[in-house]
Structure formats: structure tokens, C-alpha cells
């Protein structure tokens, strides 16, 4: 029977993924009930991607190395759809670092997994980034102009932001 | 908590091969994918070749291409690099490292993507 195998391949996954995220939050995608997409709860899902607040404040190397042993990275965002999403999830008085950086001091802006930087889809504050010296970017609340990026120095601990692709069982 | 362990380095002449091994331990090794990066003396660390954790899917850096391979043994818990017409400008200490991934088919390639880092294995090519 075609669904009593792909329901024991199921549970087989889950229970392989389970030391990793001990609960998974699946949803059927489209009519098919083959495809569940899942994100480990109490991540929030967006589109193809799952998403993490991190309240423990660490530097930026210490919060990737956080997201990448949960087999996330710190966020890259790619649409303004995308940061209205995250924002949803942030608390105004608080900043959190995002998964781009500048380590050689030029402004030479990487995205951690290595996505193209694109000028055109950014969201910096008005006048950042403004300092060489801080190379690591996060996104916090100014009530003039809401919620936008602004680059700081990396070893400063702040809130985090992970972001993982669904996991398709 | 993974651990791992390269091996297979050494010196060898310009145009010779090696294949480099990463032995890994500690968890579920299909779990993972795997990534080679390597560190000249004063240069910085840059990655070389990766592979998805299902072994379907590789990338390497554009100096490498053609030359070396990037394989899995998901069974032996153990990755490899085949390193095929060596140049002198490939003399550098070699790492393997692992990341956690529920992705079948995503090879990555960035160094900070990768938590789990071996101690290295030196390769030295003369000319």
C-alpha cells in the first residue's frame, strides 16, 4: 500500500530528525498529502523558510555558530516581504543581529551562506552603515523610520535571528 | 558532538594525486554535510568543495574544478577529497567540517556555515 509506505518513511524521518528538534510542526502542502513541510516548533514559517528569535544575547560569531548547530544560519534577507514578516516577531526595544557582515572592514557586505549582496534590496537605516570598524549588521527599531539595519561592532552581544529551509517529510 | 579527523596529507610532486580523508564520529554522520576548506600560510582560510549530505549534490571553488572530487561513504561515516593534478599553489593545510542539515540536497559554502571543524591534514606540493 503506497500510503502505509510513505506514512512508515514519515515516521521514520521524524524519528531521525527528533534529537535534532524534539517537535515539528507540519503542514500538507497543496492537495498532494504526499508533501508535509515542517518547521521545529516554535519556530514560525514563512514561505519556504522556518525562522527563530534568539533572546540570548552573543556576539555575531557565537549566535551563527548558535544557529548553524540547529542546521540554520543567521537570517538573510532577500525581500522587503520577507523583513515584514521577521518584523512581526521583534520586539521594538531590542536589536538582533543578521546573518551579514563586512569582515575585511571595506564594505565589502557577505551574506553568511554566501547569497549575492544585492545594494537594491537593502533596508539600512538613513546614514548607515556608517563606521568601518563595525562589521556586523543587525535590525532594531527607530521610531522615525521603523525597522531597518544598521552595522555595529561584532563582538557586542545582541539578540538573534536564525533562518533554516522547511524540512520536507 | 561530532569529531573529526582528516588524514592523507603530504608531500607530493606538481602534476601527483591525493586523496584526503575525513573520518567522523560522534553522531549520525548522514545528518550532515560535509565541506573541504584549506589555509596557505598567510593567507586566509577558503573553502574548496562541498557536498549535500545525501552526496547528490557538490560545488567547488573555480581554481579546483575539473580537478579535485568531492565524495561521501554515508555507511563508513567518512568523507573524501580527491586531489588530482596538484598544482604548487594548492600547498595548504586541508579541513574537513560538518554541518547539521535537513536539506538532502544543499551543499554549502560558506566557512561560517560549518560548526564542526577537524584539526587539518598539511598537503605540500613541490614543483
Known amino acids: 500500500n503506497f500510503m502505509y509506505s510513505k506514512t512508515v518513511k514519515r515516521l521514520s524521518k521524524l524519528r531521525e530528525y527528533q534529537q535534532y528538534h524534539p517537535s515539528l510542526t507540519c503542514v500538507m502542502e497543496g492537495k498532494d498529502i504526499e508533501d508535509w513541510s515542517c518547521c521545529p516548533t516554535p519556530w514560525t514559517s514563512f514561505q519556504s523558510s522556518c525562522y527563530f528569535i534568539s533572546t540570548g544575547m552573543q556576539s555575531w560569531t557565537k549566535s551563527q555558530k548558535n544557529c548553524s548547530v540547529m542546521g540554520a544560519d543567521l537570517v538573510v534577507i532577500n525581500t522587503r516581504e520577507e523583513q515584514d514578516f521577521i518584523i512581526q516577531n521583534l520586539k521594538r526595544n531590542s536589536s538582533y543581529f543578521l546573518g551579514l557582515s563586512d569582515p575585511g572592514g571595506r564594505r565589502h557586505w557577505q551574506w553568511v551562506d554566501q547569497t549575492p549582496y544585492n545594494e537594491n534590496v537593502t533596508f539600512w537605516h538613513s546614514g548607515e552603515p556608517n563606521n568601518l570598524d563595525e562589521r556586523c549588521a543587525i535590525i532594531n527599531f527607530r521610531s522615525s523610520e521603523e525597522w531597518g539595519w544598521n552595522d555595529i561592532h561584532c563582538h557586542v552581544p545582541q539578540k538573534s535571528i536564525c533562518k533554516m529551509k522547511k524540512i520536507y517529510i | 558532538q561530532v569529531q573529526l579527523q582528516e588524514s592523507g596529507g603530504g608531500l607530493v610532486q606538481a602534476g601527483d594525486s591525493l586523496r584526503l580523508s575525513c573520518a567522523a564520529s560522534?553522531?549520525?554522520?548522514?545528518?550532515?554535510?560535509m565541506g573541504w576548506f584549506r589555509q596557505a600560510p598567510g593567507k586566509e582560510r577558503e573553502f574548496v568543495a562541498a557536498i549535500s549530505r545525501s552526496g547528490g549534490s557538490t560545488d567547488y571553488r573555480d581554481s579546483v574544478k575539473g580537478r579535485f572530487t568531492i565524495s561521501r561513504d554515508n555507511d563508513l561515516n567518512a568523507g573524501y577529497l580527491q586531489m588530482n593534478s596538484l598544482k604548487p599553489e594548492d600547498t595548504a593545510v586541508y579541513y574537513c567540517?560538518?554541518?547539521?542539515?535537513?536539506?538532502?540536497?544543499?551543499?554549502?559554502?560558506?566557512?561560517?556555515?560549518?560548526?564542526?571543524w577537524g584539526q587539518g591534514t598539511q598537503v605540500t606540493v613541490s614543483s
Open positions: 560522534g553522531d549520525t554522520f548522514s545528518m550532515y554535510a
Open positions: 567540517a560538518l554541518r547539521l542539515t535537513f536539506s538532502t540536497t544543499t551543499a554549502y559554502t560558506g566557512e561560517l556555515q560549518y560548526p564542526y
